[in-house]
């Protein structure tokens, strides 16, 4: 199976006539309304390969999914930057691709989590996130939608930008997330969430072990390992973020 | 314009298969989804199944198991290898691929279809 990080073929030419499409939110405009596999090619970005999810909402880009622990997400930046994982499993889409999809607009950031119970959370964020220039920072632009209404962080107006065990840009200078955490994620002071950290089939005993597992603070708890994961993105219309 | 042709139709007794083509005259690589559907007489068209550029299937339940779809971007052509097949598969299969124009505006190709027909 490919790579999240493979580039298509270059081989394969795009005839004069058409083109691919932008991303997903393009494929649903023009009236698909079957979820999958497309190849997209965002404004000067090579063709790539993304998992759409069509809903009620419009397209959807699927940018981060988890379910088994088939793969490992403690990976270093380069990774977290190109991508990894199997499009038909566990994945990491890419902070570039990510990027190239929703350019200087705000975004739709939605997130799905499921514990081991059955139960289920979906919360939307308004977002602009950065280029590489600003480590991939994300930034809320409004108030987040569900449930957990806005104890959720980063609040408002704040921008975090994403760390790796090798690129340390959290907000704590007395310790870097990453590296006492697991995986890459947007960490602010290491505690509100991490979604790429490891992966737990059963509770570990060691809170030591705990912390570094997939969760969300205000849902299930600091020390609750999320069953699965699913984090999604849809750029709004055309004008620029602020 | 893309102009796609179907071929591979044909007189086939109840179990038998069948394997139908479809020929593109520029590149696919561009459509974002390829697919079959097929009309009999006095009926609807009615989607068989069909492909996307990255891979994912989608299958009529009618068909499911018995007929499988794939796409060779490298050949610009689209084939529906077709597996025990029934009389109520009788009916002229179309091909169809849709795609994003450099004029940002939604295309919808069609092929001008080949008649299978099933014996019992």
């Known amino acids: 199976l490919p790579e999240m990080a493979q580039p298509v073929d270059p081989a394969h030419n795009v005839s004069r006539l058409h083109r691919l499409p932008r991303d997903c939110q393009e494929l649903f405009q023009v009236g698909e309304r079957q979820s999958g596999l497309f190849e997209i090619q965002p404004q000067g970005s090579p063709p790539f390969l993304v998992n759409c999810k069509m809903t009620s909402d419009g397209g959807w880009t699927v940018i981060q999914r988890r379910h088994d622990g088939s793969v490992d997400f403690n990976r270093p930046w380069e990774a977290y930057k190109a991508g990894f994982g199997d499009p038909h499993g566990e994945f990491w889409l890419g902070l570039e691709k990510v990027h190239s999809i929703t350019g200087d607009r705000n975004s739709r950031l939605a997130v799905q989590l499921r514990d081991w119970d059955g139960n289920a959370e979906l919360l939307q964020f308004s977002v602009h996130l950065g280029g590489e220039d600003t480590a991939y920072s994300l930034q809320l632009t409004a108030p987040v939608a569900g449930q957990l209404g806005a104890t959720t962080v980063p609040p408002s107006g704040l921008s975090v930008p994403f760390s790796t065990w090798d690129q340390d840009h959290d907000l704590r200078r007395d310790k870097n997330c990453a590296k006492s955490l697991s995986g890459g994620w947007w960490f602010g002071t290491c505690s509100h969430s991490n979604l790429n950290g490891q992966y737990f089939r059963s509770i570990p005993q060691q809170r030591q072990k705990l912390k570094k597992g997939i969760f969300w603070k205000t849902w299930r708890g600091r020390y609750y390992p999320l069953q699965a994961t699913t984090m999604l993105i849809q750029p709004m219309a055309a004008e620029a973020a602020s | 314009e893309v102009q796609l042709v179907e071929s591979g139709g044909g007189l086939v007794q109840a179990g038998g298969s069948l394997r139908l083509s479809c020929a593109a005259s520029?590149?696919?690589?561009?459509?974002?989804?390829t697919g079959w559907y097929r009309q009999a007489p006095g009926k609807q068209r009615e989607l068989v199944a069909s492909?996307?550029?990255?891979?994912?299937?989608t299958y009529a339940d009618s068909v499911k198991g018995r007929f499988t779809i794939s796409r060779d971007n490298a050949k610009n052509t689209v084939h529906l290898q077709m597996h025990s097949l029934k009389p109520e598969d009788t009916a002229v299969y179309f091909c169809?691929?849709?795609?994003?124009?450099?004029?940002?505006?939604?295309?919808?190709?069609w092929g001008q279809g080949t008649q299978v027909t099933v014996s019992s």
């Open positions: 169809n691929g849709r795609s994003i124009g450099v004029d940002d505006m939604p295309y919808v190709y």
């Open positions: 492909i996307t550029s990255g891979g994912s299937l």
């Open positions: 520029e590149s696919i690589f561009s459509l974002y989804v």
